[in-house]
Interface confidence: low
């Protein structure tokens, strides 16, 4: 008599989450009589998946009609697969008995569930950093299976190499998570830059998922300050300008000090953006030199994005300008500024 064979032709089956999985099993003989049962796992802790003889298994249906006597196909279809269904499935022939006696098991079919990774979420540093500093960006994606996954980092289309990636858990699991931290060196031109975390996985059919972060959230470009004096005007007033250039973000406060005393404070707002994403701002003061005996020390003090103030000073040489008797009267009467210093910004 030919020995009974339980044949599971596929060693492994891979199914996308949500799809149905077909697990094939045929037997070489219907003798001896007895049921076929499907289990996930082996040994005493195995889980009954389907019993052709009895029970209620709503997600499992037989591929062929098991009630037909000549049917030797005991394949099943499991619907709406989730990552929790992953495992090795065994088709097992029992001989009728009390209890039924296990005769032979198939070799097993490993069901792997392809679950798409979640959209990568890229998070940047909590505080801004300046050019030449290195900042870290973290990318996380969850819920994928199988474990094999590729993660790449790009900055403006150029692939980055300084990153560390971990896939958890290390052992077998129904689904996995990936976390990667990239180190990016900032440059002054990075206001418009983007970092992209690209995740490639078998479930994505070659169309990787991308998460992005704008370096504008991570970078601080400190301003350049330049204080200059325009040529003397006919009315004995000197125009002193403070040019604040190439800064980001826009949050900036400018204070004019005259001989150490606060003259005017301004806040930057609604500035036009430079091509590189930075901002420029010019503030000016009119100094009535005839109202002063001594040289006037003007200081342009800039506080950018909550950082310590940066100063640039300039001395208006009163001695270099001839005094005109009574020339300051009109200026004083304007009531604009007791110190005969007037200003604006643009």
């Amino acid at each position: 008599e030919e020995e009974l064979q339980v044949i599971q032709p596929e060693k492994s089956v891979s199914v996308a989450a949500g799809d149905s999985a077909t697990l094939n099993c045929t037997v070489s003989s219907l003798i001896p009589v007895g049921p076929i049962q499907w289990f996930r796992g082996a040994g005493p802790g195995r889980e009954l998946i389907y019993n052709l003889k009895e029970g209620h298994f709503p997600r499992v249906t037989p591929v062929s009609d098991p009630t037909k006597r000549n049917n030797m196909d005991f394949s099943i279809r499991i619907s709406n697969i989730t990552p929790a269904d992953a495992g090795t499935y065994y088709c097992v022939k029992f001989r009728k008995g009390s209890p039924d006696v296990e005769l032979k098991s198939g070799a097993g079919t490993e069901l792997s569930v392809r679950a798409k990774p979640s959209a990568p979420v890229v998070s940047g540093p909590a505080v801004r950093a300046t050019a030449e500093h290195t900042v870290s960006f973290t990318c996380e994606s969850h819920g994928f299976s199988p474990r094999d996954i590729t993660l790449k980092w790009f900055k403006n289309g150029n692939e980055l190499s300084d990153f560390q990636t971990n896939v958890d858990p290390a052992g077998k699991s129904v689904s996995y998570s990936i976390r990667s931290t990239a180190r990016v060196v900032l440059t002054r031109r990075d206001v418009h830059s983007q970092v992209i975390c690209e995740v490639a996985h078998v479930t994505l059919q070659g169309d990787p998922l991308r998460g992005t972060a704008n370096l504008s959230e991570a970078i601080r470009v400190p301003p350049f300050l330049e204080v200059t004096q325009q040529s003397m005007r006919a009315d004995n007033q000197v125009n002193v300008t403070c040019q604040v250039t190439k800064f980001y973000p826009q949050r900036l406060q400018l204070t004019w000090l005259e001989n150490g005393n606060v003259s005017r404070t301004e806040m930057a707002s609604a500035l036009p953006e430079n091509k590189d994403g930075t901002y420029n701002w010019t503030s000016w003061l009119l100094v009535n030199v005839s109202a002063h005996r001594d040289d006037v020390k003007l200081t342009c003090q800039v506080e950018h994005d909550g950082q310590p103030a940066v100063n640039k000073s300039f001395s208006v040489k009163v001695s270099a300008h001839p005094k005109e008797q009574g020339s300051n009267t009109a200026a004083e009467n304007t009531g604009t500024n007791e110190r005969n210093i007037y200003g604006g910004s643009g």
Epitope: N156, G157, N158, E159, V185, T187, R188, R189, V191, H192, S193, K275, D276, G277
Partner: antibody
Amino acid sequence: EVQLVESGGGLVQPGGSLRLSCAASGFTLSSYDMHWVRQAPGKGLEWVSAIGTAGDTYYTGSVKGRFTISRENAKNSLYLQMNSLRAEDTAVYYCVRGGVWDDAFDIWGQGTMVTVSS
Amino acid sequence: DIQMTQSPSSLSASVGDRVTITCRASQGINNYAAWFQQKPGKAPKSLIYTASSLHSGVPSKFSGSGSGTDFTLTISSLQPEDFATYYCQQYVSYPYTFGQGTKLEIK
């Protein structure tokens, strides 16, 4: 006026070396990505090399290990050191400035001719 | 490397004509496509960047369009000074690559 002026081209034997220079004026070279592009006689344009603002360097496959791009900020100049020259390196070499934020080429030099022949 | 395939390789047209040159990238390059004009014995001149933006000083008769893999350069009304060779380029990733060129000749 923003300008790029290349120099250093000439006739060199196969296996020889040459150093191309590109003098920039009207802008600060170190603030831009800078490139070398070449054009063999009667042929199309070929990107050769680039140097980023952070000093990162890039090369086309055929020149890797033979050419070195560098810049000298104090002189506002870009260089291309070409070693182990081959006949197929014969071309006009252009110095090109990349745009401020997307690196699109905006300013080209007039080019310098390099001839590799025995 | 990303290949840029330009067509046609040569084109005859008359003054006043509207001409279109196309360029196809071997993979998606977003809109990082540029167009250049080159006259014999001269350095190339930058015309268009990010597929459709005109460099300063470039007349508005030049226009570009496209995204992903397919790009076009259109010259709305040809003038004698427009007869030259035109190149497309991708600059999304190194190595940057150019199309083989389209020679625009007077008919």
